[in-house]
């Protein structure tokens, strides 16, 4: 601990100029004071001044008022510093002396004489308020006040708590009257050395080195460090922990960049056709009657469905068709007959039955023949039952579908994808072809599976014309041009006419 006992001398009265021994001072009592401060004693005894002692220069003659003086000799209040815990009790001896010698250092002069002395014993708490007192004896009177205050940076009831305000990385605080720390705004902790981070900053994933800051630990982002960072390159995915890539619905692959729902995301099938997903970036369009093409984008001839009956021939018109009926038939589809059974209209052994009192007839056809007049051999392939370009074959009373490579099922409706196992390396695109999967490689790679890194990019020189797409790694020349509609040739350099219209089948 550390503090100061302060004694303020205010007035000394010795009207008759007398010494303690009854003698008078000549020409007057030139007065100085000796102060002795020690531990509390019930009966004051001589001995060392355990808490300190101090002397004054000559302050006046006989009776005088003592003025406050802050520096130099004759300082008032008198200061008695101590370097221990203030015990709260004390004994104080104040002696008034007469000196015939030096004003400034009377203590050293011979022949000094005691004028009077007072002794105070009691308790005194640390504080700023002065305790005022007055002591009289038969000859003299002394007015004074005293207090105990803590030295700079010492606090508490006994001046035992050391506290030094600071604002550096070992603490940001000021000192309370009791010596406890009062943190500066934005700081916390026993020593006020911990910054208070931005409100809401995640406790585990964020930290700060100064107040109102939020620095994210690796794998986290956002103002409050509460958003995880997904795997680098994650395209259509999210994370719940750092470096994760959990795919959004319809996406797959390590980086969620493989479209598992191409149909929904891109709607590639036209003219009301049905789209079916088949693996990453794979889909099949099932066309409505009257449409064909990979995306059902090509309209078939209106006559393709053979609407004319009884051997009528079909002619395409702008938005419909027209049936040219053979002799003996009429109606939009040549469905009405002017013939009767008498005209023997039933072919291939069909039996004729009269209807409407003989004004019309109906043919009952033998097996494998059909038509109003049994004129058609039954073709179970006319309804185009084979999907995905499958070939229909009549086999007696039944028919079978011969499927293209990559398809299976009774109607070739099931897709077998060689690409399902992702055989193409380095981001190559897979295509199901008759002889197995073929990879189209990105620039800089070639080989059947894009496994060969090539130093020379054959597509770099732009060898394909008319907006064709260039691919490397599919041929000995190291590039292949994929021609846009209407162009042919190894570099798509030749324009061609539109393909012939779908042939009409009687």
């Amino acid at each position: 601990g550390s503090g100061i006992f302060q004694l303020r001398l205010q007035e000394f009265v010795n009207q008759r100029g007398m010494l303690a021994n009854g003698q008078s001072c000549e020409p007057g009592c030139r007065t100085f004071f000796r102060i002795c401060l020690k531990h509390f004693q019930a009966t004051f005894s001589e001995g060392p001044c355990t808490f300190g002692n101090v002397s004054t220069p000559v302050l006046g003659t006989n009776s005088f008022v003592v003025r406050d003086k802050n520096s130099g000799s004759g300082r008032n209040p008198l200061q008695l510093p101590f370097n221990f815990t203030w015990p709260g009790t004390f004994s104080l001896n104040i002696q008034a002396w007469h000196t015939p010698g030096d004003d400034l250092r009377p203590e050293t002069s011979p022949g000094n004489s005691l004028i009077s002395q007072i002794i105070i014993q009691g308790s005194l708490a640390v504080g700023k308020i002065w305790r005022t007192d007055e002591q009289n004896d038969t000859l003299t009177r002394l007015s004074y006040s005293y207090r105990v205050i803590c030295s700079d940076n010492y606090y508490g009831e006994s001046c035992s708590r050391l506290c030094k305000k600071r604002d550096d990385h070992f603490g940001h605080y000021e000192c309370q009257p009791d010596g406890s720390l009062s943190c500066l705004p934005g700081w916390t902790g026993k020593y006020c050395d911990q910054p208070i981070c931005l409100s809401g900053c995640h406790e585990q994933n964020g930290y700060c080195s100064k107040p109102d800051e939020c620095i994210c630990r690796p794998g986290w982002q956002g103002r409050l460090c509460n958003e995880c960072i997904p795997h680098n390159g994650c395209r259509h995915g999210t994370c719940s922990i750092p470096w994760q890539c959990a795919c959004d619905e319809g996406w797959g692959g390590l980086f969620c960049d493989q479209d598992l729902n191409y149909c929904t995301h891109h709607s590639p099938c036209k003219n009301g056709s049905t789209c079916s997903n088949s693996g990453p970036k794979g889909y099949t369009c099932t066309c409505l009657p009257g449409y064909t093409g990979e995306h059902c984008e090509l309209g078939l001839s209106k006559c393709a469905s053979n609407p004319c009956r009884n051997g009528g021939s079909c002619k395409d018109q702008e938005n419909s068709y027209h049936c040219l009926c053979p002799p003996g038939y009429y109606g939009q589809h040549c469905e009405h007959s002017t013939l009767t059974c008498a005209d023997s209209p039933c072919f291939n052994g069909g039996s004729c039955r009269e209807r409407n009192q003989g004004s019309s007839y109906a043919c009952e056809c033998p097996p494998n023949f059909t038509g109003s007049n049994c004129e058609k051999k039954v073709d179970r392939c006319t309804s185009n039952p084979c999907a995905n370009g499958g070939q229909c074959q009549n086999r007696g009373p039944s028919r079978t579908c011969r499927c293209r490579p990559g398809f299976t099922g009774t109607h070739c409706e099931l897709h077998i994808s060689d690409c399902a196992r992702s055989p193409c390396a380095h981001g190559g695109t897979c295509h199901d072809l008759e002889n197995g999967p073929v990879c189209t490689c990105p620039a800089g790679f070639s080989g059947r599976r894009c496994e060969v890194r090539i130093t020379h990019d054959a597509c770099a020189s732009g060898p394909c014309f008319n907006g064709a797409t260039c691919y490397t790694g599919l041929s000995p020349n190291n590039f292949v041009c994929n021609c846009p509609y209407g162009f042919v040739g190894s570099r798509c350099e030749f324009p061609v006419g539109l393909p012939p219209s779908f042939p009409w089948v009687a």
């Epitope: 700079d152 940076n153 050391l162 030094k164 305000k165 600071r166 604002d167 550096d168 990385h169 070992f170 603490g171 902790g189 020593y191 050395d193 911990q194 930290y207 700060c208 080195s209 620095i215």
Partner: antibody, heavy 121, light 107 residues
Framework: EVQLQESGPGLVKPGETLSLTCTVS??????????WGWIRQAPGKGLEWIGD???????YYNPSLKSRVTISVDTSKNQFYLKLSSVRAEDTAVYYC?????????????WGQGTLVTVSS | EYVLTQSPDFQSVTPKEKVTITCSGQ??????ASWYQQKPDQSPKLVIY???KRPSGVPSRFSGSNSGDDATLTINSLEAEDAATYYC?????????FGQGTKVEIK
Amino acid sequence: EVQLQESGPGLVKPGETLSLTCTVSGGSISSSSYYWGWIRQAPGKGLEWIGDIYYTGSTYYNPSLKSRVTISVDTSKNQFYLKLSSVRAEDTAVYYCAREDVILRGGSDYWGQGTLVTVSS
Amino acid sequence: EYVLTQSPDFQSVTPKEKVTITCSGQRLGDKYASWYQQKPDQSPKLVIYEDSKRPSGVPSRFSGSNSGDDATLTINSLEAEDAATYYCQAWDRDTGVFGQGTKVEIK
């Protein structure tokens, strides 16, 4: 008991970067009560504080060396590091790493044994 | 730049004698002073922190004080093992500052 151990090359050419590692054992570098400092002592001279670091990565440098000094920390390895760039002959010194204690008001209660780094071509 | 100046630079003392080393700096009393003992070819050792406190294991003959512009290290009754160089240290804002050192030699 906490121990600190400096390691790194003993000879560095002028103009190059001096790199030292301090490995802490017997205690965690991630404690909130400590800063981890570097101090050097040129032959026959006094101590010079270089800088210190908190486990979160907050750094404080001596203004006279600030432009050339980088201190970093790896809590997973319980190590902190000193890099001093563009070294010159007067950077020849024994380099100490030390623990600065908040409770001791910044006093350094544990020191490494020091490593001598000589700057010479 | 904050400067700490120690005095004396060198002191030759007989055993059992009292040693006083002073460290001066502007308003040093408002900062916490630490003292380090360094023997030849050894690392510094903390002997006083927070002006006057001794770490465990440091003999009671070592004491410290700090007020005004001066911090003081006192070795009350010097022993042969106390021969060393003593450094004062304080923090000025966020920078550590050392005194130039005082070498204490046994006569």
